[in-house]
Interface confidence: low
């Protein structure tokens, strides 16, 4: 019959060429000599010569190697005409279908990604996603199938499997416990990604995860002691200021402190602030202090941070002794 | 298919830098491999490194990482090689040389006629 | 990095006979080994690739043969113009590697 079935071609074929693919015939050649050409994309249009056919055997010929990722699928059409020119049978059909060869490797769509996620999270928290891609079919073959890897993690603390990827998203989640911003405030992995479901060409890129901060840390007081003078009767007076370190992240939510007197100022005589630079609190005389009335007061301070703790923390307290010191007041008459 | 490295010989001073190019015709310049070889005098073969223009995708060969920069323009299929801090070691006669995308695993079918570089002062 | 050993380092030989050039390489690079030809003051001409592919245009007098790690260069009815330097080369792994070369002479 006046037929042919879908022809599969392997891409990038070495030859030699022209290599034979199929052979056109009609029945009509028992009557009459049969001159066969095809006419398409591929054969008399762009791209022009990639086949061809032997005018009396019918033999389709292909001229050159193919690419499937230019061209997946070319449709010609075959014809049989007389020695006199006459058409013999209609135009036919003819599916030439480029069958893929793993010959792109797979490429990332960037060099270098960028996430970010919270110290401290639980395993299975994602962080972000890496992709590739790769002009290779991963729908018939796996050739283009890209399966992701994390090849190695810098730096290796605290040990070096903190991140695990999706194998076929690329998304990266957290695999362990342990990220701490203080410690290690950014990671860099090198990803790869691998066509053939892991089993081909492998390309690589870089995936920089930055450790964001939580408040995991608590102010401390540095010192926790202090002793103070204050002349009696001294308004806004500043009787001392008091220093903290806090390991989290400078000038955020989570180390600037807040000051609270726990104790000791029954008579409301203080007031604490912070410092908005220094992070200090300034403790200072709310009213005038009384020599006669009580010559020295014992303080308690606590100190918590902006932001409320992500985990349970102690809270640290300083003591302040003031000494209050004495005035020659005028008599009283 | 055609490489013509465009610049002649070239006479160069130690600690200096020299650029050779090499210009394609008759291919796909993109979708092929370009590769530098140098030959010193009397000597063999080395590979230096190739660049794919498709992407600017390159890959060295450890002795030349930070010797040799590979670029190349799409848009006049030129491919270049800049050579830094040059010494007399780097007196050489230097080939590019297409090689094609078959997953990269193909020998270098077409060179360039190769640009002498002697380096001294 | 891989090692490509060629031999022999020169040859002479007389027009009309045959000679054979071997290299091996350190490693299995299955057949992915490329001949080229050089002569003096020219650029390498590539004959041979995937170690038995002829490149167009070379005369069937060379015959590339092996795979793996050992690999031949064959040239049958040595012509003048067949005098020059050989060099195999390993592409397959990056660094790309050539062999040192054998220089054949004319006797």
């Known amino acids: 019959d006046w037929v042919v079935a879908p022809i599969s071609v392997p891409e990038n074929g070495k030859g030699p060429f022209p290599q034979r693919l199929n052979q056109l015939k009609s029945n009509k050649d028992r009557d009459t000599k049969i001159f066969y050409s095809i006419t398409g994309p591929g054969a008399d249009s762009p791209p022009e010569g990639v086949f061809a056919v032997e005018k009396e055997t019918g033999w389709l010929l292909l001229n050159k190697p193919l690419d499937r990722e230019e061209i997946a699928k070319y449709e010609l059409f075959g014809h049989a005409v007389s020695e006199n020119g006459a058409s013999v049978e209609d135009p036919m059909n003819i599916s030439i279908i480029v069958t893929d060869q793993n010959d792109h490797k797979p490429k990332f769509t960037q060099d270098t990604f960028r996430g970010s996620v919270l110290e401290g999270v639980m395993p299975g928290t994602s962080v972000m996603q890496v992709t590739a891609t790769d002009e290779d079919d991963a729908v018939n073959t796996y050739n283009g199938v890209v399966a992701y890897s994390i090849h190695s993690q810098e730096p290796k603390e605290p040990h070096d499997l903190m991140f695990t990827i999706h194998k076929s998203t690329g998304t990266i989640s957290v695999i362990s416990s342990g990220l701490d911003r203080e410690k290690v405030p950014e990671y860099r992995l090198t990803v790869q990604a691998t066509d053939m479901d892991g089993e081909g060409s492998t390309t690589t890129a870089e995936a920089v995860v930055q450790i964001l901060d939580a408040n995991d840390n608590a102010p401390e007081f540095d010192p926790q002691k202090y002793e103070a003078h204050v002349p009696e009767n001294a308004v806004g007076h500043e009787v001392q200021r008091l220093t903290v370190t806090d390991l989290d992240a400078p000038n955020s939510p989570a180390w600037r402190a807040t000051y609270l007197i726990m104790g000791g100022d029954d008579g409301d005589h203080f007031t604490i602030t912070t410092h908005p630079e220094s992070n200090q609190g300034i403790l200072t005389t709310r009213k005038g202090l009384d020599f006669e009335a009580k010559n020295q007061h014992t303080l308690y301070v606590e100190v918590t941070n902006e932001a409320p703790f992500v985990l349970k923390l102690p809270t640290s307290t300083a003591t302040i002794v003031v000494h209050v010191e004495d005035v020659n007041e005028a008599p009283v008459f | 298919v055609q490489l013509v490295e465009e610049s002649g010989p070239e006479l160069v001073k130690p600690g200096a830098s020299v650029k050779i190019s090499c210009k394609a015709s008759?291919?796909?310049?993109?979708?092929?491999?370009m590769n530098w070889v140098k030959q010193r005098p009397g000597k063999g073969l080395e590979w230096i490194g190739r660049?794919?223009?498709?992407?600017?995708?390159?890959k060295y060969n450890g002795k030349f990482k930070g010797k040799a920069t590979l670029t190349a323009d799409k848009s006049s299929s030129t491919a270049y090689m800049q050579l830094s801090s040059l010494t007399s070691e780097d007196s050489a006669v230097y080939f590019c040389?297409?090689?094609?995308?078959?997953?990269?695993?193909?020998?270098?079918?077409?060179w360039g006629q190769g640009t002498s570089v002697t380096v001294s002062s | 990095e891989l090692v490509m050993t060629q031999s022999p380092a020169s040859l002479s030989a007389s027009v009309g006979e045959t000679v054979t050039i071997t290299c091996r390489a350190s490693d299995d690079i299955y057949s992915y080994l490329a001949w080229y030809q050089q002569k003096q003051g020219k650029s390498p001409q590539l004959l041979v690739y995937n170690a038995k592919t002829l490149a167009e245009g070379v005369p069937s007098r060379f015959s590339g043969s092996g795979s793996g790690t050992q690999f031949s260069l064959k040239i049958n009815s040595l012509q003048p113009e067949d005098f020059g330097t050989y060099y195999c080369q390993n592409h397959y792994v990056t660094p790309f590697t050539f062999g040192a070369g054998t220089k054949l002479e004319i006797k």
């Open positions: 660049i794919y223009p498709g992407d600017g995708e390159t």
């Open positions: 008759g291919y796909a310049f993109s979708s092929s491999w």
């Open positions: 040389a297409r090689q094609r995308d078959y997953g990269a695993l193909y020998a270098m079918d077409y």
